[in-house]
Every structure is written in C-alpha cells, then in structure tokens.
Amino acid sequence: EICGPGIDIRNDYQQLKRLENCTVIEGYLHILLISKAEDYRSYRFPKLTVITEYLLLFRVAGLESLGDLFPNLTVIRGWKLFYNYALVIFEMTNLKDIGLYNLRNITRGAIRIEKNADLCYLSTVDWSLILDAVSNNYIVGNKPPKECGDLCPGTMEEKPMCEKTTINNEYNYRCWTTNRCQKMCPSTCGKRACTENNECCHPECLGSCSAPDNDTACVACRHYYYAGVCVPACPPNTYRFEGWRCVDRDFCANILSAESSDSEGFVIHDGECMQECPSGFIRNGSQSMYCIPCEGPCPKVCEEEKKTKTIDSVTSAQMLQGCTIFKGNLLINIRRGNNIASELENFMGLIEVVTGYVKIRHSHALVSLSFLKNLRLILGEEQLEGNYSFYVLDNQNLQQLWDWDHRNLTIKAGKMYFAFNPKLCVSEIYRMEEVTGTKGRQSKGDINTRNNGERASCESDVLHFTSTTTSKNRIIITWHRYRPPDYRDLISFTVYYKEAPFKNVTEYDGQDACGSNSWNMVDVDLPPNKDVEPGILLHGLKPWTQYAVYVKAVTLTMVENDHIRGAKSEILYIRTNASVPSIPLDVLSASNSSSQLIVKWNPPSLPNGNLSYYIVRWQRQPQDGYLYRHNYCSKDKIPIRKYADGTIDIEEVTENPKTEVCGGEKGPCCACPKTEAEKQAEKEEAEYRKVFENFLHNSIFVPRPE
C-alpha cells in the first residue's frame, strides 16, 4: 500500500498504527512530540521499505532504536527535503542507536543527527555508502564516541562479522548496532545494489532486491516504478509522479490536492504530473492540465476575505509573497520595523495590480513606496469614502512615492488624497497626478500644499561635481560650493555612496525611517576658505567596483517662511581602479603519469578587475626524509575531551593537546588562542544551528485544530 501524502505522528504513540500496511510512504514521515515514554516493542512495520521524501524524528520519549520499528526501510529518496536534510534525528532523549540496518540509500539530501544525548553507533556507520556526498551531514551533540564503546558484531569474540571501510583515515568495522552489520555489496557490483546473498541487482534497482539482475524484483527503483517494473524513464502516455513512479493522465486528473480542496487540480508539465505549474509557467486556462510559459512574472492572484488587507508588519506582508494581482484593498500602516523597506519589497515587490484602493497612513517607518516596485495598476473598483482609490495620510518620514522616471502607474478610477506628509514634496505628488492619469480628478482639498512637504527641501538646487579621481580603493570627489541666498544658512554637506553594479539606483533604495539605509553616509564640513571647493576622500573601497555617489547640502534656508530650500547632486557612477586579484581558489594537483601533473583551480573570489590570464609556476622539491621516519602504525595518544550531554553548547576538543616546554617544565600547555577565522567559523556554526532549530520549531509546531 502506498501511504501519503505525508504522515505526521505526534502526541500519541498509538498513531503509529497508521503505518501498518504501508510499503511506500509517498511523502514525509514525522514522528514527534511524544512526551510519555512508551514501550514500542509491540510496534513493528516490516512492510515499509521506501519513504519518498524525508524522515524526521523529534522528541519521542522511550524510543531506543529505529531498527525494530522499520526493519526493512531501505531507501529515503529525499524528493522533498526538510531544510536540506532527508533524515533528521533531533533531541531524541532515549535513542541509543539508529538501527536502520536495511537502509542502503538516501538518494538526495544530507542527514542531521543532533542533540541526542544517549545516541551511539554513529561513528560505526559509513554514510558514504548510503549517500552520494557526506560533506553536508551534520552529526553534532550526541553521546561522545569515547563514552559509547561501540562494538560491532563479533568483535568481542574476536570473530568480527562486519566489513571494514575507511572514514577520516580510520579503517574500521561498520555496523548499525551491537548485532547488525552495515550491509555492503561486492565491488564487482559497482554502483548497483545487491541481494542478501551478495548477488548484484538489476541496474534499475535501488537499495536491494529479492533476485539478481531482475528489474521486477527490486525493493526500490533507481529511477521510476511502473506496473511492477523499474524503468529508466516513464513509458509514453505516462508521467513522472512524486519523483518515483509513473502514472497515467486519468490518475493525474483525479488526484485531490492535499493542501486545499478547492485547488485547480494537478497539471502535466514536461513529462511530470505535479501539483502546480513550475516557476515561470502558468496553466493554459483555469481548467487546463497543461502549462505555458509566463510573459514576465507569473500571475498569482491573492484575495483577502475581509476585502481589506492590513499591512502593519513584515509578518502580514509575508502573506503576499509572490502575489502579482491583489483582489481587494491594501491598507499600509507600518509604524516601526527593522530593515523594513527591503523586507516589504521582498514580500510585496511582485504586486502589479490592486483591484480596490491603496491607503497608506501613519506609516512613519516608510521613506518611500518603492517597495511596491512592480505596482502598475490600481483599479479603484472599491473606493474609500470621498471616492479615493489612493490615500496617503500622516506619514511623518515619507519622502518619495516612486521613481517616476522609471515607473508607469495607472489609477483607473477614483481620486488621490494627500495630507500631513511633512517630508513629501508637493511636486512629487503632482508628478504622480501626471503619471497616473488622475490629473483633474483631485480637488483643492485633496492635495494640501501646506501640510505636505513643509519639513522637506522641496526646492532643490543642483550641486555639480567638479572633479573625480580614483585609485584601487579610493575615490576623491569635489563639487561646486553651493551658495544659498543667505550664505550663513549652509551648514555642511552629506556624501552618500554605495556599491552599484548597475546604473539603476535611486536615493531611497533600501532606506526606511528606522535606521536601515543601503547608502553609506559621510558628513563633510565647509572648507574654511571660501574659495576652496568642498570635497571628500572615500577610502576602504573595493578595487574594480562601481560605486554610486551623491551629495546633499544641509541648509536652514526657508522659502517665504514656508518650505526648506536645499541642494543635491545627481547620482554619479564611478568605478575604482583594478588591483591585484586575490589568490585562486581550490588548487588541486594530481599526477596522471610519471611525467605529468594536472593542476586545477577555481577563479579568485575577488578578481579586482578583468582577469586576462593565470601564471602557473612549479619547481621540483626534495623528498622529505620525515616521511620515512614516522611510524604510521603507532596509535596517537587518546585526546583529552569534554563530554557532551546531548546539548552542543560545549566545545568538543578532538585535537591532541600540545606538550611543549612551558615555564621551564614539560607538561600540557594552555590551548593557543583562537584565530579570528576560527572564531568566525564558530560564530557561523552557532548561527546555523539556531537557524535550523527555528526552522524545525516553525515547521512542526502548529495550532491545535479547532
């Protein structure tokens, strides 16, 4: 029996009975949050051989081994992963060994085995026999191997039953438990699986088989399963499904979506039966089972039940991620937030059409509306009282609506209203009237020239750059000395600069009123000599990098006791000079004959210019006599270690302590202070652990159903 679309067993261990007849779980298997220690010995699911997605175990009290539960689990396909992992064993307080002695293949993804205080038999499993790559495996914070004393079958009797492999230069026996070896196939089978009797399976088999060289006797299929046979590709008129089997059109048409009962059904695309069209494609009609490429971003219609969606935080904006058409009204009320502009752009930046009205009020955190970077049409099918479809009220820091030189926005019906936006220049509003086609709709009361822009430099003169000089990591710029009507009103200048690979930045990019700003800022005092032009040396820049730079004058001048008069430059794009590139990465050399070396490398991470060629130098080295002096059979001293307790806040010491002359005596010395690189690596590691744990908690803790 195929079970699915994913099985979540939590709180009550008796729910395990749901697995009774499963041979394949088409989806994931979660076993988690069973806090009462139970006796699992009566539960055994020998039929289960394949999980198509991932296996997650988390906080299951009393479970000591997985071997009795899933004695025949052979393949975890990893078609969909849990945070890049196909097997996650996390905070299993009583688990003593994994024990999945028939697990032969994890097709995709890595494993994460973490914070299992009692878990042993980890160093005895050779994961490279099960996974293609072991570098992404994360096995941390479990019972220290030195405390485990893992012994493979027969070792005590000096009749070892298991085979040996090398892991980290250590050649040792491989087993899952004290009485179960890790199965290995003869080298003659190559990448193929084998039977219990070490006969090679058919190439299309994966994990194991019941008879040699027979594509109908596979435990699991390397590619696809169809009508009892493992096939390299699905036959004509059948389609790949869930990454492991072939189904016909009728099957695909009749699948009910797990996510929602009112979804449009599955589609067939590129030979696969899938829940929805892939990125860049859209259904060819609402009832169609086929996909066509989108022109530009694919439309995604989002609707708000209550008609009006209030965006008052990043969390509420998240609900609109990917939406291109919003059916309803948007009420934006962002009073505070961290890095709000870029977060909002991330979640709302694809919206092209709003069918109702847009209202922005009390959004003191906003400096610009450019986070709605694709908004091109407000239909105004529903309007606010007074027939407004665009309403902007009391936004204390709003300075820019959009960059109208690069923006087409149409307001099909309804008027605009602007009031109490002290930093929003009225000229910016009138420009919006022109662009949006609302000119003439607004009345005198809709755009108040007194309470919009009264605290902004709306009357801006243009500052002109007079010179620019560059080196590999410096830019020197000067500009004309600005002379406002009253010279005493000029306080200073502020220079804004940032990396700009493309010439498309605006003054308000990534800026919000809560301190986030993608621009670096430097204050420049007025030169005391009135004949000297102001300027600045920007240093610490990257070589061969284009920067955007602009300058603002900071003034006090008022126009007729009304608006502040200021001055700023256009945005200047300037590239630093080229420099010596950083070292080429990942240099590898290997000899393929007695007279040749093959050397490979990756380009430098910082080319600092356009790379034109590489220089390869080599020289003959005398052979090192030390290689002959060292006894490779001798065991190193056992490392001093701190013991883990199932948490991973304690640093594990695995290197041998240095023994040198210290203070005139021989004896162990203090550990050398950590290098910056080591500290940084530790910091990143801790951060990575937190991110995973947050992901785990967010994924599995869900509100109790009503």
Epitope: G386, G445, T449
Partner: antibody, heavy 119, light 112 residues
Framework: QVQLQESGPGLVKPSGTLSLTCAVS?????????WSWVRQPPGKGLEWIGE???????NYNPSLKSRVTISVDKSKNQFSLKLSSVTAADTAVYYC????????????WGQGTLVTVSS | DVVMTQSPLSLPVTPGEPASISCRSS???????????LDWYLQKPGQSPQLLIY???NRASGVPDRFSGSGSGTDFTLKISRVEPEDVGVYYC?????????FGGGTKVEIK
C-alpha cells in the same frame, strides 16, 4: 505684502497668440501656492483659465485647454500665460492671481490688464 | 463642470439695512476632510476682485465682521448685517472643490 503685476500687449490680432507675464514681488513664487490666471470679458463675469505650481505642474480649464499654456520662471519670480488662436471672444481683462492654501482661496489679485483681439 | 447659480442678479440695498445673497451649486461642495470649498469675492467698480469669505464661512484677513458666510452641501448664503456705501459692487461665489474652478454669474449690489 505680495503684489502681482500683469504685463503684455494690449492688442492682439485674431488667430494670433496672446502672451502675458505676471511678476510676483514681496514673496517667492516657490512658496506653496498655485499661481492662476482669471479673465473677465467686458461687462461679464469671471472665468478661471488655469493655474501653475512652481514645480511646473498645471491645471487648465477644459474649455480652453487646447489653446492654453502656463509656464513659470523661478529665476525671475514670474509666471506667464499664452493663449493661441485667439478670436474676438477672447477680449477680456486678464488677471493674474494667487490661490493660497493658507486662506484656501484666491487671496491676491493683480490689477488686471485689458487685452483686445482685433485686426 | 460644477455649475454655480447666484440670485438675485441685482440687489438694491439701503445703507444700514441687512442684505443677503444666495448661491447654489450643481453638486455638494463638502469635501471628505470636512471643509466646504466655497469662496465669496467682491469686485468693487473698476477694481480687481477681493476675497471675502473662504471655506464657506471663514472671513479673510481685513474683512469687516458685518460679512458672514453660511450654508452647506449645495446651498450657500452671504449676509451683510448692515450695508455700508463702500460695499457696492458685484459679489461672486466660487467653488474650488472640482477642477475647473467655476464662478457664479455675480450679484450686483447697489444703493437704492
């Protein structure tokens, strides 16, 4: 005290272009007000022609829109009216004025200049 | 366009007596911000118009308190509590709610 002064030819030939300038003194044209033109044919009522903001944004009376251009010159603190393809019906006293958002109304008017369209 | 209709066309008055002028608009001049966008202007003989009342009922700077404006929605009234000889001229109402701004036809106030 803001003062407005219209200037321009008092006689324009039919089908020609009427051009008037309004000089603003006692205040900046860059303040947050709209600068308007209003006309009054002899013995008749007032007709609003259009207005301009210092940023260059304009609003025109739809009945005249195809023939009217209002522009601003901030450096000279003045704004101008051009009315093309004039006929005798365009004969009127032309006033420049300021629509204020302080008092929310046309609070300052020029003294007006009579423009006659005649051959 | 919003059509403004004034009555009467002509109003002979006696100095010291009250006077009242009516103005009706073809649509409500009440804005959603609560203000009524109606102004009253007086054009004395041979002069430019001058602002008397703005936003329906607010007296402009320097305007004597014998002038008052009232009304809401579409019906408005300018009252002069005691007419003085210098009050003669043509009185215009003007709406500023919708573009284009439009004036009433005017009411000529003259001494009997």
């Amino acid at each position: 005290q803001v003062q407005l002064q219209e200037s321009g030819p008092g006689l324009v030939k039919p089908s020609g272009t009427l051009s008037l300038t309004c000089a603003v003194s006692g205040g900046s044209i860059s303040s947050s007000n709209w600068w308007s033109w209003v006309r009054q044919p002899p013995g008749k009522g007032l007709e609003w022609i259009g207005e301009i903001y210092h940023s260059g944004s304009t609003n025109y009376n739809p009945s005249l829109k195809s023939r009217v251009t209002i522009s601003v010159d901030k450096s000279k603190n003045q704004f101008s009216l051009k009315l093309s393809s004039v006929t005798a019906a365009d004969t009127a006293v032309y006033y420049c004025a300021r629509y204020s958002y302080g008092t929310v109304g046309i609070d300052y008017w020029g003294q007006g200049t009579l423009v006659t369209v005649s051959s | 366009d919003v059509v403004m209709t004034q009555s009467p066309l002509s109003l002979p008055v006696t100095p010291g007596e009250p006077a009242s002028i009516s103005c009706r608009s073809s649509q409500s001049l009440l804005h959603s911000n609560g203000y009524t966008y109606l102004d009253w202007y007086l054009q004395k003989p041979g002069q430019s118009p001058q602002l008397l009342i703005y936003l329906g009922s607010n007296r402009a700077s320097g305007v004597p308190d014998r002038f008052s404006g009232s009304g809401s929605g579409t019906d408005f009234t300018l009252k002069i509590s005691r007419v003085e000889p210098e009050d003669v001229g043509v009185y215009y109402c003007m709406q500023a709610l919708e573009m284009p701004l439009t004036f009433g036809g005017g009411t000529k106030v003259e001494i009997k």
